[in-house]
Structures are given as structure tokens and as C-alpha cells.
């Protein structure tokens, strides 16, 4: 009973808090649970008590076991117990499960990684911040104050994200590292009616005859997973299968893209070595979803060779 | 011995607000946490929310979030407890009593308040 | 929020008698659960905290077990002195009382 898990590295400092809550007058007495010997409050010891927390400075494998904190107020004595592990530095890059924090989910609107029990410790910024071992470098990433902001979040952002800062005591610093991992999950999802990105209403395009060319449809219709939502092009009101001419070809499959967050999808039309009744078609790509159709024409144009005298 | 001392009876309309004091003797009000207690007549006991004297930080029951405010003066080692917008169901017994972060050991001997129009 | 649910609300007991009550938490409380006797127009008088530490001065007749989600109160032998209203307090999370459980001269 209020008994609380604490782990720490050999050779970096560790600092406990009495799992009891209590006012910071209250006098804390710290214990060896095994021997019940009492733990020093001078701060020469590398392992010493100084109110509500327990310091090891630094940690060591054999400081591993339980101590107990007696919080006495003035109207009562409250027992907490802290069971401390200390763990031999990993060789590898490798972070073991039993040295991670909490897991912390992140969104695109929300990214934000507390460096855990850094509220314990004398430390100043900035913070160091790791991912898989590699320091985070680029403008994505904002060590702000206790905590790393990553800008326009990813599902590859997920992994382990380890802090590191110093610990101060009395002059002397003190490593500290601290691994939790960071899982991005899908803002909840939505549909809306369809947004053609392009091309423009009523767009025209000014193509080489005898050249190829390329037209793309690209519609956005919600956010995250759409049940329905397609693209595709027609002709003069026709379907392109519908439409006997070969040169011209709706790529298959249609790729789905996220921008901003949003689902949007694009299908490409090929039209090779352009011909002049190709420039009397009416073009039209279609976005379609269970809200409705929207669509929006292009027409080709000759393209006007400019003569320089 | 440790003495909670609080303030007389009151009566007070619908809407109107009440401010009872607890005067405590033979403690520093500093050293502990102050509680408020409310019990409707013939009711139990309901908790309303503790205030750390020594540094102002209060906690409030939902139950009475935004309507009670609890202080204190410690040079005078006075708590005080204001409830506002009275309604009839607030006619109750008022307790103080001080104790740490989890429970009350010693009480004072309680304030009777009506509301009544 | 923690819920307390307190039995029974009335218990009727003749002295000598050995009478339990029970509080039980809709969430696993740690055994932050302490014991309360209030005798009419009286202030509560705290008898036992921490789940069964019992109160200096308390009597030993009184004796507080359990934990997790249920926590009972005894009185081995009920002395005429103990005829009150019992109150559990959980304070895991706030502080919320029970809803009594007037002990009665059967």
C-alpha cells in the first residue's frame, strides 16, 4: 500500500518522492525498509533524505530495494513505501521496457513529450532530446521548457523519445536520462463534400500539338479513413472507357494522399501526342462521396509561340 | 489541548451569503490543513474542501465548486469559509477541523445556519 | 468520483454485542479509509485512520480491517458508550463521506 515503483540508471542521479501527499513542513523520516536503519539527511552522503525526497547521488545496482518514508504532521504519521530499482547501463542502443515511462499519444494539433519526473530535480534548459538513440535535430523539433514539441506530426514520429538534463546538488552535476515512448494517433475522422484542388473551374491549358500531356484530378473529401470517395475524369460528359480513343487514358488506381491531415485523392489523365479535335473536348473530372458530386472543367488551348524579333 | 472555535448561528435569505470563522488555540494553523464539513439536519456528513493556511492552495467538492470559498489568516490563525447564492437545502451544520491532506482529527463544534425567506 | 456506499444505515445492538459495518468503494481506495463516531448535537470523534490504525485514546474494542474496495468497522463487545452514528471517510481521491449507520439500543 501506498507503495510506489522508482528506476533509475547506475552512475546518473535518481530522486524518490514519499508516495504520501503532505504539506513540505511536515518532517519525513526515511527508512531502510530491510534493516529500518535510518537514511542520513546530510548532503555529503551519496545517498541522503532532504524532506519528501529521497537523493541518490549518484545511483548505484546496490541502492536497489525498498525504503520507507514516515510523513509526520502535527495530527498524523502516514507511511509510503518506494521501491527502487537501479539498472546497469544498457550497451546498446536498446531502451528495456522496465526502464520506460508512461507511453504518451500525440496528434497533428497536439505533439507535446513531458520529460518524465523532471519536476523532481534541479535542472536548467535546455533539454536534450533523443529518438531510437539519434539526437533530434531540424526545425521540427522545439525542446520548450520540460517538454519536446514536434511540428506536423507523423506516424513515423512514433518511437522512443529519451530526455536528457543535469541534475544540480550543491555544485556538482548529475546526468539524468529518462525513456517513454510516443504513439500518434488519428484525429478522429470526418467527411465533408468534395474539394477540388484542381484543377481550377473552368481552367484552360495550353498544350503542344503532337506533344503528350498530363491532367490531373485531385479532390479532398474529410479527414482520416473515407468509406467512399473517388475521382476520375470524363469526356464531353462520357465515361474515358465509354470513349473509344485509346490515346487518351485514365491512369489506373487512384492515389491517396493526405495533406494537412486531409484524404484527398488524385487520378491522372494521359493524353498522348495531342491532336487539334482533342482541343474541342470538354474535360471534366468528378469527385464523388457520400455528400455529393462536384466538378470541375478544363479545356485545352494551343499553345501561342511567342516570336521574338 | 487543540480548540476549533467557531462562529455563532446565523440566518441568512435565499441568495445571500454566509461567512463563518474557526478560530483555532494551542496550534499553529500553518502546520496542518483546515477542512470544511457540512451536515444537512438529520443528514450525514458531506465534505466541502481544505485549505493548505501556510500557502492559500484550496481544493473544492464539485457539490460546491464555485460557490464556497475557503481562507484563512494565519497571523490570527483564523480560517473562514464563505458560502454564496444560499438556497434552503444549505440550512446545515457547518464544521471546521483540521487535520493533514487525507483526513480531520480535531473539529470545532460546528455553526448552525438557516436559510430562510 | 469515488462513491461510498455504507451498511447498514440502522443497526439495532445490545450491549456486549460484537457488530460490524461495512463501506464499500466502486474504485480499489489504497486504504485511505478512516472511522468516525458522532453522538448527537457533537462534532464526529475520529476513531480509527489509515484503515485500522486506531486513534490514541480510542478504546481496543474498536478495530478497523480490510482493503481494496471493502473496509469494515468492528466493536467487539458494545459498551453503552458507543451508541452513535458511524461515518467511513475515503480520501484516495477528495474526501467523501459515507452514508452513515446509526447504531441503536436494540
Known amino acids: 500500500k501506498f507503495s510506489k515503483q522508482s528506476w533509475g540508471l547506475e552512475n546518473e542521479a535518481l530522486i524518490v518522492r514519499c508516495p504520501r501527499q503532505g504539506k513540505s513542513s511536515y518532517i519525513v523520516d526515511w527508512y531502510y525498509s530491510q534493516t529500518n536503519k535510518s537514511i542520513p539527511t546530510q548532503e555529503r552522503n551519496r545517498v541522503f533524505a532532504s524532506g519528501q525526497l529521497l537523493k541518490f547521488l549518484p545511483a548505484e545496482v546496490a541502492d536497489s530495494g525498498i525504503y520507507t518514508c514516515i510523513v509526520r504532521s502535527p495530527t498524523f504519521n502516514r507511511t509510503g513505501y518506494a521501491n527502487v530499482t537501479i539498472y546497469k547501463k544498457q550497451p546498446d542502443c536498446n531502451v528495456p521496457d522496465y526502464l520506460m515511462y508512461s507511453t504518451v499519444s500525440g496528434s497533428e494539433k497536439n505533439s507535446k513529450i513531458y520529460c518524465p519526473t523532471i519536476d523532481l530535480y534541479n535542472w536548467t534548459a535546455p533539454l536534450e532530446w533523443f529518438k531510437n538513440c539519434q539526437a533530434l535535430q531540424g526545425s521540427r523539433y522545439k525542446a520548450h521548457k520540460s517538454f519536446l514539441v514536434i511540428d506536423n506530426v507523423m506516424t513515423d514520429d512514433a518511437g522512443d523519445y529519451t530526455c536528457k538534463f543535469i541534475h544540480n546538488e550543491n555544485g556538482a552535476n548529475y546526468s539524468v536520462t529518462a525513456t517513454r515512448s510516443f504513439t500518434v494517433k488519428d484525429e478522429q475522422g470526418f467527411s465533408l463534400f468534395p474539394v477540388i484542388r484542381a484543377p481550377a473551374h473552368n481552367e484552360t491549358k495550353e498544350v503542344e500539338i503532337g506533344e503528350n500531356t498530363n491532367l490531373t484530378c485531385s479532390a479532398c473529401f474529410g479527414k482520416g479513413a473515407q468509406f467512399l470517395a473517388t475521382v476520375q475524369w470524363q469526356l464531353n460528359g462520357n465515361k474515358i472507357t465509354d470513349f473509344s480513343e485509346p490515346r487518351i487514358q485514365q491512369e489506373e488506381g487512384q492515389n491517396q494522399s493526405f495533406s494537412n491531415g486531409l484524404a484527398c485523392v488524385n487520378t491522372v489523365l494521359r493524353i498522348a501526342d495531342v491532336k487539334e479535335e482533342d482541343l474541342l473536348l470538354r474535360y471534366d473530372c468528378l469527385a464523388l462521396n457520400l455528400h455529393g458530386l462536384r466538378r470541375h472543367t478544363i479545356r485545352l488551348s494551343r499553345k501561342h509561340h511567342h516570336h521574338h524579333h | 489541548e487543540v480548540q476549533l472555535v467557531q462562529s455563532g448561528a446565523e440566518v441568512k435569505k435565499p441568495g445571500a451569503t454566509v461567512k463563518i470563522s474557526c478560530k483555532v488555540s494551542a496550534f499553529n494553523i500553518k502546520d496542518d490543513y483546515m477542512h470544511w464539513v457540512q451536515q444537512a439536519p438529520g443528514k450525514g456528513l458531506e465534505w466541502m474542501g481544505r485549505?493548505?493556511?501556510?500557502?492559500?492552495?484550496?481544493e473544492y467538492a464539485e457539490k460546491f465548486q464555485g460557490r464556497v470559498t475557503i481562507t484563512a489568516d494565519t497571523s490570527t490563525d483564523t480560517a473562514y469559509m464563505e458560502l454564496s447564492s444560499l438556497r434552503s437545502e444549505d440550512t446545515a451544520v457547518y464544521y471546521c477541523?483540521?487535520?493533514?491532506?487525507?483526513?480531520?482529527?480535531?473539529w470545532g463544534q460546528g455553526t448552525l445556519v438557516t436559510v430562510s425567506s | 468520483d469515488i462513491q461510498m456506499t455504507q451498511s447498514p444505515s440502522t443497526l439495532s445492538a445490545s450491549v456486549g454485542d460484537r457488530v460490524t459495518i461495512t463501506c464499500i468503494t466502486n474504485t480499489d481506495i489504497d486504504d485511505v479509509i478512516h472511522w468516525y463516531q458522532q453522538k448527537p448535537g457533537k462534532a464526529p470523534k475520529l476513531l480509527i485512520y489509515?484503515?485500522?490504525t486506531l486513534r490514541p485514546g480510542v478504546p481496543s474494542r474498536f478495530s478497523g480491517s480490510g482493503s481494496g474496495t471493502e473496509f469494515t468497522l468492528t466493536i467487539s463487545s458494545l459498551q453503552p458508550d458507543d451508541f452513535a452514528t458511524y461515518y467511513c471517510l475515503q480520501s484516495d481521491n477528495m474526501l467523501t463521506f459515507g452514508q452513515g449507520t446509526k447504531l441503536e439500543i436494540k
Open positions: 477541523a483540521t487535520g493533514d491532506f487525507y483526513a480531520m482529527a480535531y
Open positions: 485549505i493548505d493556511p501556510a500557502i492559500g492552495n484550496t
Open positions: 489509515e484503515g485500522n
